[in-house]
């Protein structure tokens, strides 16, 4: 799986959109989890409605939400007031019994608002590869590493 | 029981090269990402680089480029690590490390560090 | 390369004393922040991880704190075992880099 950058600024939301073969995932409940590194285990966050019909139904856990647009084959989670905790690995999961395809590998990363001026001089806006070798930037909001690609970041 | 455990001491003379092994047990190095870490006496820590052993990619800090070289077999869940054109400022410990990689990795294991001198 | 820039280098404290490490980093690092304890002749040991998260098995005296640029490693009651080398070291891009290190010695 590629990794999609999607980058929001502290404060605010920023929406993640995972898409998937509709008819291939047809009747599967989907999750979003929090993987602890690179290489780390997925914690789950928020999975959708136990209802496979009410997918379309957002469900809340604290501040992540989520919503499933079965027919169009479309995740959408939500993160409210983005945090720098915020920051890290994730990944859009479709559930078969214990089992979890992978959807998207995400990796969420939290620029700091420009409006806050709390200490200008700490203002970061990340340069086109500055996280990632060679990465491609797709305007702003999200990017994709290609395949094998590692983070460059990636301690613990 | 999980732990790293490194080769022995090593004395070399300037110009020669060396190779420190770092073998895993309790867990299987392709779930992880094998680092090496050096510290000269009485100094402070210093990354030297790191090896994805699942995929066989390595990277070096900039210093090392070229003179180091980090490889892995993961038949014998073994790391290793060569320092070629060893100079008298290359004594130091040794450490190998694994950890799931940045971004909040909650593993982390260290070796117990091997000492190379290097003296002529 | 990132720089870390701990400080003080040293510090001398006596046991119950609360202790604050800071480090800055010379770039934006998010919370990729961990900091290390270290004992002479034995490998370094983690603390807290992603900035603020204990790591398994560490007292919850200490605590980490920070983002973006600056870190703070507390201790809120030192206790004898807790003299040693501290370490941060940012995991937001390779190289990793190491603060230079705080020495917590016996006041």
């Known amino acids: 799986h590629n990794t999609t950058v999607f980058q929001g600024v502290e404060g605010q939301s920023l929406q993640v959109s995972c898409p998937y073969d509709s008819m291939k995932h047809w009747g599967r409940r989907k999750a979003w989890c929090r993987q602890l590194g690179e290489k780390g285990p997925c914690q789950r966050v928020v999975s959708t409605h136990n209802l496979w019909l009410l997918s379309f139904l957002r469900r809340r856990n604290g501040s992540t939400a989520i919503t499933d647009d079965t027919l169009g084959g479309t995740l959408t989670i939500t993160l409210r007031n983005l945090q720098p905790h915020d920051a890290g690995f994730y990944q859009c999961q479709s559930l078969h019994g214990s089992e979890a395809d992978t959807l998207r590998k995400v990796l969420v990363e939290v620029l700091a608002d420009p409006l806050d001026h709390r200490d200008a001089g700490d203002l970061w806006v990340p340069g086109e590869s500055e996280s990632f070798e060679d990465a491609h930037v797709e305007h702003s909001i999200s990017r994709s590493l290609l395949e094998g690609e590692i983070p460059f970041p990636p301690t613990s | 029981q999980v732990q790293l455990v490194q080769s022995g001491a090593e004395v070399k003379k300037p110009g020669a090269s060396v190779k420190v092994s770092c073998k895993a047990s309790g867990f299987s190095i392709e779930d992880f990402y094998i680092h090496w870490v050096r510290q000269a006496p009485g100094q402070g820590l210093e990354w030297m680089g790191w090896i994805d052993p699942e995929q066989g990619e390595s990277k070096y800090a900039p210093k090392f480029q070229g003179r180091a070289t980090i490889t892995a077999d993961t038949s014998t869940s073994t790391a290793y690590m060569e320092l070629s054109s060893l100079r008298s400022e290359d004594t130091a410990v040794y450490y190998c490390h694994a950890d799931h990689g940045n971004y909040g990795s909650t593993m982390d294991y260290w070796g117990q560090g091997t000492l190379v001198t290097v003296s002529s | 390369d990132i720089q870390m820039t701990q400080s003080p280098s040293s510090l001398s404290a006596s046991v119950g004393d609360r202790v604050t490490i800071t480090c800055h980093a010379s770039?934006?690092?998010?919370?990729?922040l961990s900091w290390y304890q270290q004992k002479p002749g034995k490998a370094p040991k983690l603390l807290i991880y992603?900035?603020?998260n204990l790591h398994t098995g560490v007292p919850s005296r200490f605590s980490g704190s920070g983002s973006g640029t600056d870190f703070t490693l507390t201790i809120s009651s030192l206790q004898p075992e807790d003299f040693a080398t501290y370490y941060c070291q940012q995991g937001q891009t390779y190289p990793r880099t190491f603060g230079q290190g705080t020495k917590v010695e016996i006041k």
């Open positions: 992603k900035a603020s």
């Open positions: 770039q934006h690092i998010n919370v990729w």
